[in-house]
């Protein structure tokens, strides 16, 4: 692969459908602008979950309607995905691009298998 990207192999979402994991990349140089994308792979189909571009030293900013939030510290990005349900169980791949200054470097993680278990409905109380 090109740039090395590390992420945990498995994460279990909370009962509220929230999953967090760290995506860490080994930067060849001193990038000032970084783009992080979370991709979901299921049945050989890859879809984009969310993406954010940030300047080193600044916070990640996802779109307002994004299901992702995150913080960055050096070459490490802490990602949180919300609103997950059992059907969202799958492999979540972290893609990191060093956008500026040139040259462009790309790295793809091996993916984090996120397991989501829908909570049991509360029993009716008499």
């Amino acid at each position: 692969k090109a740039m090395h990207v590390a992420q945990p192999a498995v994460v279990l979402a909370s009962s509220r459908g929230i999953a967090s994991f760290v995506c860490e990349y080994a930067s060849p140089g001193k990038a000032t602008e970084v783009r992080v994308t979370v991709l979901r792979q299921a049945d050989s189909q890859v879809t984009e979950v969310c993406a954010a571009t940030y300047m080193m030293g600044n916070e990640l900013t996802f779109l307002d309607d994004s299901i992702c939030t995150g913080t960055s510290s050096g070459n490490q990005v802490n990602l949180t995905i919300q609103g997950l349900r059992a059907m969202d169980t799958g492999l979540y791949i972290c893609k990191v691009e060093l956008m500026y200054p040139p040259p462009y470097y790309l790295g793809i993680g091996n993916g984090t298998q996120i397991y989501v278990i829908d909570p049991e409905p509360c029993p009716d109380s008499d």
């Epitope: 692969k1 090109a2 090395h4 080994a26 930067s27 060849p28 140089g29 001193k30 991709l39 890859v46 791949i93 893609k95 691009e97 956008m99 040139p102 040259p103 462009y104 470097y105 790309l106 793809i108």
Partner: antibody, heavy 115, light 107 residues
């Protein structure tokens, strides 16, 4: 201004050796992965070799067509990258470019392998 | 290894035409694709990096699109100075293979 200047090309006999050099300036050389790419007469671009930098332990990668015959190296103190070419074949004839991870390119140096 | 299938191999179009060149990869390269322009006697010039991003100093006539295994370079309005050979390249992983090239001429 970014500059990559290749040298060392010329006429070489089949089976012979040649060493290409590429001197870089205008950017932080040690932050970059360096590559050699060639273009044979009437052919397309062919990636040959890559050397990564210190954070990547100077890992090297080669195309199948040159693996075992060509060696890429670098000297960060001299802002230079090299391509040692051994057991040259007539099909190695072409213009050789050095490039800083494909963003910046040199002007190229012509290597002709012929008897 | 990732195989790059570029088409067409040559193309003739008129000034002002919209021109598209495609590149298909043998497996998903996650947008790790660059496009280059090479004019005779000149070094290759990076046009598009990461499938969609315009390189510094490149005319906005050029744009890139695509994901997965299918990618496109578009010239919105062909100009005489665009006569060149265009190449795609996989930059996801070694070997960093190039497409076979598209030679673009003016009618």
């Amino acid at each position: 201004e970014v500059q990559l200047v290749e040298s060392g090309g010329g006429l070489v006999q089949p089976g012979g050796s040649s060493r290409l050099s590429c001197a870089a300036s205008g950017f932080t050389f040690s932050d970059n992965w360096m590559n050699w790419v060639r273009q044979a007469p009437g052919k397309g671009l062919e990636w040959l070799a890559q050397i990564r930098n210190k954070p990547y332990n100077y890992e090297t990668y080669y195309s199948a067509s040159v693996k075992g015959r060509f060696t890429i190296s670098r000297d960060d103190s001299k802002n230079s990258v090299y391509l040692q070419m051994n057991s040259l074949k007539t099909e190695d004839t072409g213009v050789y470019y050095c490039t800083a991870q494909f963003a910046y390119w040199g002007q190229g140096t012509l290597v002709t392998v012929s008897s | 290894d990732i195989q790059m299938t570029q088409s067409p191999s040559s193309l003739s179009a008129s000034v002002g035409d919209r021109v598209t060149i495609t590149c298909r990869t043998s497996e998903n390269i996650y947008g790790g694709l660059n496009w280059y322009q090479r004019k005779p006697g000149k070094s290759p010039k990076l046009l598009i990096y990461g499938a969609t991003n315009l390189a510094s100093g490149v005319s906005s006539r050029f744009s890139g699109s695509g994901s997965g295994t299918d990618y496109t370079l578009t010239i919105s309005s062909l100009q005489p100075e665009d006569v060149a050979t265009y190449y795609c390249q996989n930059v996801l992983r070694s070997p960093f293979t190039f497409g076979s090239g598209t030679k673009l001429e003016i009618k």
